[in-house]
């Protein structure tokens, strides 16, 4: 499955929107830094494209879920959030088309299922952190920074997959 060129443009726009969403000086939030344990190994180059697409899809779906909550709506600018949702939704559509193309071709590798589970647990840790921090502005900024980093790493994987073709 070939992801359209617009997909990587959408990824860049998503990162730009995340950057624009910032609301407070980050320097006041240093002590709120947290190790969320991003499962970087699940986005390593050892994966075949067919195995990677569902993991990337899960990643973007979880980002969508995280920023779709009422707590998120209270934390961020509504206009930017709407643009953010639109970009994520388009990327999910692109990836879903690839997932559907791949159905029935091979058995779902156990490794892929483990990777999806690792991504879900990662987002559970993020959600728990926000809850423990009572959804404070700094907690949201730490999470935004973390999502920018993890999204960027997963985007780099998409680019490396495209360049290998």
């Amino acid at each position: 499955c070939d992801l359209p060129q617009t997909h990587s443009l959408g990824s860049r726009r998503t990162l730009m929107l995340l950057a624009q969403m910032r609301r407070i000086s980050l320097f006041s939030c240093l002590k709120d830094r947290h190790d969320f344990g991003f499962p970087q190994e699940e986005f390593g180059n050892q994966f075949q494209k067919a195995e990677t697409i569902p993991v990337l899809h899960e990643m973007i779906q979880q980002i969508f879920n995280l920023f779709s909550t009422k707590d998120s709506s209270a934390a961020w600018d509504e206009t930017l959030l709407d643009k953010f949702y639109t970009e994520l939704y388009q990327q999910l559509n692109d990836l879903e088309a690839c997932v559907i193309q791949g159905v029935g071709v091979t058995e779902t590798p156990l490794m892929k299922e483990d990777s999806i589970l690792a991504v879900r647990k990662y987002f559970q840790r993020i959600t728990l952190y926000l809850k423990e921090k009572k959804y404070s502005p700094c907690a949201w900024e730490v999470v935004r920074a973390e999502i920018m980093r993890s999204f960027s790493l997963s985007t780099n994987l998409q680019e490396s997959l495209r360049s290998k073709e």
Epitope: A19, F27, L30, R33
Partner: antibody
Framework: EVQLVQSGAEVKKPGESLKISCKGS????????IGWVRQMPGKGLEWMGI????????AYSPSFQGQVTISADKSISTAYLQWSSLKASDTAMYYC??????????????WGQGTLVTVSS | DIQMTQSPSSLSASVGDRVTITCRAS??????LNWYQQKPGKAPKLLIY???SLQSGVPSRFSGSGSGTDFTLTISSLQPEDFATYYC?????????FGQGTKVEIK
């Protein structure tokens, strides 16, 4: 390869102004903060301040607030440290280093080679 | 401001020795503590971050431990290239602060 390259050594007179630079390459410049550290001859490390190049937000150590200005030009991936009126006590080696911001990642993992500033009449 | 106090300020040791440097923060900083090595005329080099994580490319003879206010840098078997000055630095809150340094010299 990640690199921070600083401008060359400077010899200045008291009262003169100066702007030294730190150019980042091999990484996304706006994804990391840039910190400045002073080391006076034979002394330890002193943190001066930091900048977020994505929007030029800055934070200073109280010891350096008002004494120096930190700025950045993200279009050329460069951070700056400047003085409007140098004093003999500003004689030191100045280092820039990158910081991961709010991410749980190594702090000051890459450093510039240092810029030696000598202020003497 | 958070004060960082290193001890000792200097020490003499031989190649193969186990060396321990301690750093104390004036208030709890969790695990937000870094260790750097600096050789004369060179920029500092990150060894340990977040109290115990070994920076990529740093030999495994270097290790860090501690949390809260008390931290330790250990060199399990001192090598000739380890003779340098070591600094701790808190990254918990601004202003960031360094310890005064520990100079490791040849006995």
């Amino acid at each position: 390869e990640v690199q921070l390259v600083q401008s060359g050594a400077e010899v200045k007179k008291p009262g003169e102004s100066l702007k030294i630079s730190c150019k980042g390459s091999g990484y996304s410049f706006t994804s990391y903060w840039i910190g400045w550290v002073r080391q006076m001859p034979g002394k330890g490390l002193e943190w001066m301040g930091i900048i977020d190049p994505s929007d030029s937000d800055t934070a200073y150590s109280p010891s350096f607030q008002g004494q120096v200005t930190i700025s950045a030009d993200k279009s050329i991936s460069t951070a700056y440290l400047q003085w409007s009126s140098l004093k003999a006590s500003d004689t030191a080696m100045y280092y820039c280093a990158r910081h991961p911001g709010l991410n749980w990642a190594p702090d000051f993992d890459y450093w510039g080679q240092g810029t030696l500033v000598t202020v003497s009449s | 401001d958070i004060q960082m106090t290193q001890s000792p300020s200097s020490l003499s040791a031989s190649v193969g020795d186990r060396v321990t440097i301690t750093c104390r923060a004036s208030q709890s900083i969790g695990k937000s503590l870094n260790w750097y090595q600096q050789k004369p005329g060179k920029a500092p080099k990150l060894l340990i971050y977040f109290a115990s994580s070994l920076q990529s490319g740093v030999p495994s003879r270097f290790s860090g431990s501690g949390s809260g206010t008390d931290f330790t840098l250990t060199i399990s078997s001192l090598q000739p290239e380890d003779f340098a000055t070591y600094y701790c630095q808190q990254s918990y809150d601004f202003p960031l602060t360094f310890g005064q340094g520990t100079k490791v010299e040849i006995k």
